[in-house]
C-alpha cells in the first residue's frame, strides 16, 4: 500500500511541477504534508533556476549533477539522494518525509553512520575481550600481542614466548631466564651481564666508590676494609669506617719532672756531658720508680771510655758494676725495689768506696783502691747515660744484662747538679715524661706491636707443634688484634682479636685462620677496671678455650680444614706479634686494628717480657700499665 | 738568645768595695758556669774566677783570694761580683762570660757587655 | 803563673787564610789545656769563638776552627772577612784557673 500511494505521489509531482511549473499551493496538494512541501519547494526552485533556458550550459558545468529539469525535480523527495550517509559505515539508506535513515554496518553509529564504534573501550566488553592489545580500526577492531608473546587461535588470547628453549644459545654464558613476554641473561651476584660479549663480567665495586676507606674487589664482590693502624674499624653497614672508640678510658698524665726511661725500645733515653772543675767524685741520688725486673737505669764513663760505672737492676734488686785501671767489680743488694713505689736511690763515690743507699739506709759498700773517674787537669769529665749504655759496652759489662727497663726518675741530682741538664732535655719532649700513675701489667698504647721468636715444636709431642695462651687482658678500646702469627708469606695463619660486639657495652673474642673467623666467643664485658683471663690451645687437631664464662672444646666441619691450613703454617715459620699486625694486607685477617690497653701474655709456660722482644713499638710499656680514669667531682 | 746584661759603670775610692751584677737571659742559669774577667786600661784580659750558679760553689784565682766574692740569685738569674779593698791598679773594665755548654766547665762561649770600675781618690 | 803568648799581630788579605796562634810558657799545649779563642771587637765587644781547643762557640761561622799545631794552640781563619778584623785574644786552662795570652791585633787589608 505504501508502495502505491509513492507512485500516485510521483505521478502528480510529474504533473503539476514537471510538465508545469507548480507554485508552493500546488506542491502542498502533491504532498499532502508542510514538512515534505517544505523540504521539496526551495530545492524545486533551485532545479527551475538551473534548467531555465539559457542556463543549460551553466547547469551541466554546475554541481548540478542532473541532465533535466525532470531527473533534478524527482530527485528532490529522494531524501537518499545524494547519500546522505558515511559511505565506509552504512550499510543502507532508507528515504523518509522530508529525512533519511542510515543503517549501520556493526562497528558504526551514528545519524549518518559517521562514527567509529572504539569497542576497545566497551564497558560490557573490557579491552575488546583481548587479553593484551586492543586495536580499534575504523568499523572494527583486532586483538595483538606484546613482543615476547604469539596469539592464539582464538584471535584474543596471548601465550608467552619461551625464549630461553627456541635460542638456548641467546645468553651465551649467563643463564638464561624467562619471563613472561621477555627472558634476562641472569648473573651470579657480583656480576654483570656484557651484551656484546655474551658473558657475566665481574663488578668492580671498587671502582664505584662503595667503600669509605679501603676496598678489595674479587670476582663476585667486594670487600670494605677500615684502617685499623690509623684507629678505625668497620661499621655495621660493612662501607663506612668509624673511629674506634675507647671503652674504658685510662689516665694518660704525664708530668715533665718525670724522666721516663723506656722511651726508646733499643738505645739511650738520655745522654749527659759532665766537665766540672770543682767535683773529683761521681754523685748520683734520684727517685726511682719501676715494675721492671731488670734493666739499666744509669751507665757513667770516662771521657776515653777507660772507667765506667753501670748501675742496673736484676731480679728487682740493685746491681752495681764498675771497671778502671785499679778494679773492676760488680754487687747486688739491697731490697727488691721493683715495687712500682717510689724508692730514694743514691750512689756517691767517697774517698775509699762506693756507697749505695735506698730511702738513705746504706744498702751496699764497695771498696776501690782509687777514685773512679781520674780528673784531668783539674776537671772532671763524664758522659752519663740513662737506661742503656753505648753499643760497644755490651761485650765490656762484668755480667751482661737486659739494658731495658720501664721505670721512671724523679728529683735527680747528678753530680751535684741539681737538675740542671736533665730538666732542660726533657721538658720539651713529652715522649719523656713519665706517667703520673702505673699499675703493674704491660700497656699497648693501640699505635705499635711487639714481636717474638716463640719455637712452637714439641718434638716429645705427637701432635708436633702447640700454642697455649693465657692472655690477662684489660682493653681500653673495644677492637685489636691482641696475637697473631705471622707467616713468612705475609699471611697470618692465627689470630685472636677483640672486637666491638652488636650488643652494647660488650666485647666479640674472634679466633681466625687467615682471613676466616673460626670462633667468636660473644658478648664478654672486656671493658671493665678487672683483668679479664682467656686461655685456649690449639694444635692441629683441637681448638679449646676458655674464658671467664666458659670452658669448651670447639668443633664444626670447617674446623678441621681450617687448622690444616694452621698446621701447614706452622711446619713453616712463624713470627708472634703482639698488640697488632705488622704490615700484612688489610684483607689477611677479619680485625687489624692495634690493641689498646693492658695486657699479659703467657705462651708454652713462658711469661712473655716485652723486654725480651726483638723488636717494639717505642710506646708500648713493657712493665707499667695506666691506671684507669677516675672521674674525680670536678672531672 | 743568650744575653749577659751587666749593671753601669762605678767609680770608687780606694779601699771601697764595689758590687757589679751580671743578669742572664736566654737560657737555664743555674746549668751554666759564670766567669769574671778583667781588662785594665791598655792591658790584656786577666781571669777572675768562676761560680756555679746551681751550687753556688766558687774558685777564685790566687791573686784574688780573699778580696773577691762572687754570688748569684738563682730566682733573678743573676751572679755578682764584689770586689774590697779596692786599689787604684783594680780600674779596669770588669765582664762576666758564661759557659756556652751546660754542666761542660771551659767554654767561655757568651760575654756581657762589660762594668767601667773606676778606682780613684 | 803560667805566661801565654800570642804574635802580637798579623796582617792578611780577604779571602785568605790566616792562623793564629797560642804558646804556653809551661810547656806544649794538649787538649787538657781546654784553650779558648775569644774575639774583642771595638767598644769591648767580646765574643767567644772557640772552647776546648776545637769546640766552635754556637753562631760562630765555620771559617773560623781551633786545633793544636805542634805545641800550640791555633786558631785559623780560612777565608778571612773584612769583619773578621779584631783583637783575638786565647785562654788556657791550668788545673785551676784560666791564663789569658796577650792577644793578637788581626788587620784585614
Known amino acids: 500500500a505504501n508502495s502505491l500511494l509513492e507512485e500516485t505521489k510521483q505521478g502528480n509531482l510529474e504533473r503539476e511541477c514537471i510538465e508545469e511549473l507548480c507554485n508552493k499551493e500546488e506542491a502542498r496538494e502533491v504532498f499532502e504534508n508542510d514538512p515534505e512541501t517544505d523540504y521539496f519547494y526551495p530545492k524545486y526552485l533551485v532545479c527551475l533556476r538551473s534548467f531555465q533556458t539559457g542556463l543549460f550550459t551553466a547547469a551541466r558545468q554546475s554541481t548540478n549533477a542532473y541532465p533535466d529539469l525532470r531527473s533534478c525535480v524527482n530527485a528532490i523527495p529522494d531524501q537518499c539522494s545524494p547519500l546522505p550517509c558515511n559511505e565506509d559505515g552504512y550499510m543502507s539508506c532508507k528515504d523518509g518525509k522530508a529525512s533519511f535513515t542510515c543503517t549501520c554496518k556493526p562497528g558504526w553509529q551514528g545519524e549518518k553512520c559517521e562514527f567509529d564504534i572504539n569497542e576497545c573501550k566497551d564497558p560490557s566488553n573490557i579491552n575488546g575481550g583481548c587479553s593484551q592489545i586492543c586495536d580499534n580500526t575504523p568499523g572494527s577492531y583486532h586483538c595483538s600481542c606484546k613482543n615476547g608473546f604469539v596469539m592464539l587461535s582464538n584471535k584474543k588470547d596471548c601465550k608467552d614466548v619461551d625464549e630461553c628453549s627456541l635460542k638456548p644459545s641467546i645468553c651465551g654464558t649467563a643463564v638464561c631466564k624467562n619471563i613472561p613476554g621477555d627472558f634476562e641473561c641472569e648473573c651470579p651476584e657480583g656480576y654483570r651481564y656484557n651484551l656484546k660479549s655474551k658473558s657475566c663480567e665481574d663488578i668492580d665495586e671498587c671502582s664505584e666508590n662503595m667503600c669509605a676507606q679501603l676496598c678489595v674487589n674479587y670476582p663476585g664482590g667486594y670487600t670494605c676494609y677500615c684502617d685499623g693502624k690509623k684507629g678505625f674499624k668497620l661499621a655495621q653497614d660493612q662501607k663506612s669506617c668509624e673511629v674506634v672508640s675507647v671503652c674504658l678510658p685510662l689516665n694518660l698524665d704525664t708530668k715533665y719532672e718525670l724522666l721516663y726511661l723506656a722511651e726508646q725500645f733499643a738505645g739511650v733515653v738520655l745522654y749527659l756531658k759532665f766537665r766540672l772543675p770543682e767535683i773529683s767524685r761521681f754523685s748520683a741520688e734520684f727517685d726511682f720508680r719501676t715494675y721492671d725486673s731488670e734493666g739499666v737505669i744509669l751507665y757513667a764513663e770516662s771521657i776515653d771510655h777507660s772507667a765506667w760505672l753501670l748501675i742496673a737492676l736484676r731480679g728487682g734488686k740493685i746491681e752495681v758494676q764498675l771497671k778502671n785501671e785499679h778494679t773492676s767489680k760488680i754487687t747486688t743488694g739491697g731490697d727488691v725495689i721493683n715495687n712500682g713505689l717510689w724508692n730514694m736511690v743514691s750512689v756517691e763515690e767517697l774517698e775509699h768506696s762506693i756507697s749505695i743507699k735506698i730511702a738513705k739506709e746504706a744498702v751496699m759498700d764497695i771498696n776501690k783502691p782509687g777514685p773512679l773517674f781520674k780528673p784531668e787537669n783539674g776537671l772532671l769529665e763524664t758522659k752519663v747515660y740513662f737506661a742503656g749504655f753505648p753499643r760497644k759496652v755490651e761485650s765490656e759489662l762484668i755480667k751482661p744484662i737486659n739494658p731495658r727497663l720501664d721505670g721512671c726518675i724523679r728529683s735527680w741530682n747528678l753530680m751535684k747538679q741539681g737538675a740542671s741538664g736533665i730538666k732542660e732535655i726533657i721538658q720539651e719532649k713529652q715522649n719523656k715524661h713519665c706517667l703520673v700513675t702505673v699499675e703493674k701489667g704491660s700497656y699497648y698504647p693501640g699505635s705499635g706491636i711487639a714481636q717474638f721468636h716463640i719455637d712452637y715444636n714439641n718434638v716429645s709431642s705427637a701432635e708436633g707443634w702447640h700454642v697455649n695462651v693465657t692472655l690477662n687482658i684489660r682493653p681500653s678500646t673495644g677492637t685489636g688484634v691482641m696475637l697473631a702469627l705471622v707467616s713468612g708469606n705475609n699471611t697470618v695463619p692465627f689470630a685472636v682479636s677483640l672486637v666491638d660486639s652488636t650488643s652494647e657495652k660488650s666485647q666479640d673474642i674472634l679466633l681466625s685462620v687467615e682471613n676466616t673467623v673460626i670462633y667468636r666467643i660473644q658478648a664478654l664485658s672486656l671493658c671493665s677496671d678487672q683483668q679479664s683471663h682467656l686461655e685456649f690451645r690449639v694444635n692441629r687437631n683441637n681448638l679449646e678455650l676458655s674464658t671467664p664464662l666458659k670452658i669448651e672444646t670447639i668443633s664444626h666441619e670447617d674446623l678441621q680444614r681450617q687448622l690444616a691450613v694452621l698446621d701447614k703454617a706452622m711446619k713453616a715459620k712463624v713470627a708472634t706479634y703482639l698488640g697488632g699486625l705488622p704490615d700484612v694486607p688489610f684483607s689477611a685477617t677479619p680485625v687489624n686494628a692495634f690493641y689498646n690497653g693492658c695486657m699479659e701474655v703467657n705462651i708454652n709456660g713462658v711469661q712473655l717480657d716485652l723486654d725480651e722482644a726483638i723488636s717494639k713499638h717505642n710506646d708500648i710499656r713493657a712493665h707499667s700499665c695506666p691506671s684507669v680514669w677516675k672521674k674525680t667531682k670536678n672531672s | 738568645q743568650v744575653q749577659l746584661v751587666q749593671s753601669g759603670a762605678e767609680v770608687k775610692k780606694p779601699g771601697a768595695s764595689v758590687k757589679v751584677s751580671c743578669k742572664s737571659s736566654?737560657?737555664?742559669?743555674?746549668?751554666?758556669?759564670m766567669h769574671w774577667v778583667r781588662q785594665a786600661p791598655g792591658q790584656g784580659l786577666e781571669w777572675m774566677g768562676w761560680?756555679?750558679?746551681?751550687?753556688?760553689?766558687?774558685n777564685y784565682a790566687q791573686k784574688f783570694q780573699g778580696r773577691v766574692t762572687m754570688t748569684r740569685d738563682t730566682s733573678i738569674s743573676t751572679a755578682y761580683m764584689e770586689m774590697s779593698r779596692l786599689r787604684s791598679d783594680d780600674t779596669a773594665v770588669y765582664y762576666c762570660?758564661?759557659?756556652?755548654?751546660?754542666?761542660?766547665?771551659?767554654?767561655?762561649?757568651?760575654w756581657g757587655q762589660g762594668t767601667l770600675v773606676t778606682v780613684s781618690s | 803563673q803560667a805566661v801565654v803568648t800570642q804574635e802580637s799581630a798579623l796582617t792578611t788579605s780577604p779571602g785568605e787564610t790566616v792562623t793564629l796562634t797560642c804558646r804556653s810558657s809551661?810547656?806544649?799545649?794538649?787538649?787538657?789545656?781546654?784553650a779558648n779563642w775569644v774575639q774583642e771587637k771595638p767598644d769591648h765587644l767580646f765574643t767567644g769563638l772557640i772552647g776546648?781547643?776545637?769546640n766552635r762557640a754556637p753562631g760562630v761561622p765555620a771559617r773560623f776552627s781551633g786545633s793544636l799545631i805542634g805545641d800550640k794552640a791555633a786558631l785559623t781563619i780560612t777565608g778571612a772577612q773584612t769583619e773578621d778584623e779584631a783583637i783575638y785574644f786565647c785562654?788556657?786552662?791550668?788545673?785551676?784557673?784560666?791564663?789569658f795570652g796577650g792577644g793578637t791585633k788581626l788587620t784585614v787589608l
Open positions: 762570660a758564661r759557659d756556652s755548654q751546660i754542666l761542660w766547665f771551659g767554654e767561655l762561649g757568651y
Open positions: 736566654g737560657h737555664t742559669f743555674t746549668g751554666y758556669y
Open positions: 761560680i756555679n750558679p746551681n751550687s753556688g760553689d766558687t
Open positions: 809551661t810547656g806544649a799545649v794538649t787538649a787538657s789545656n781546654y
Open positions: 776546648s781547643t776545637n
Open positions: 785562654a788556657l786552662w791550668y788545673s785551676d784557673h784560666f791564663v
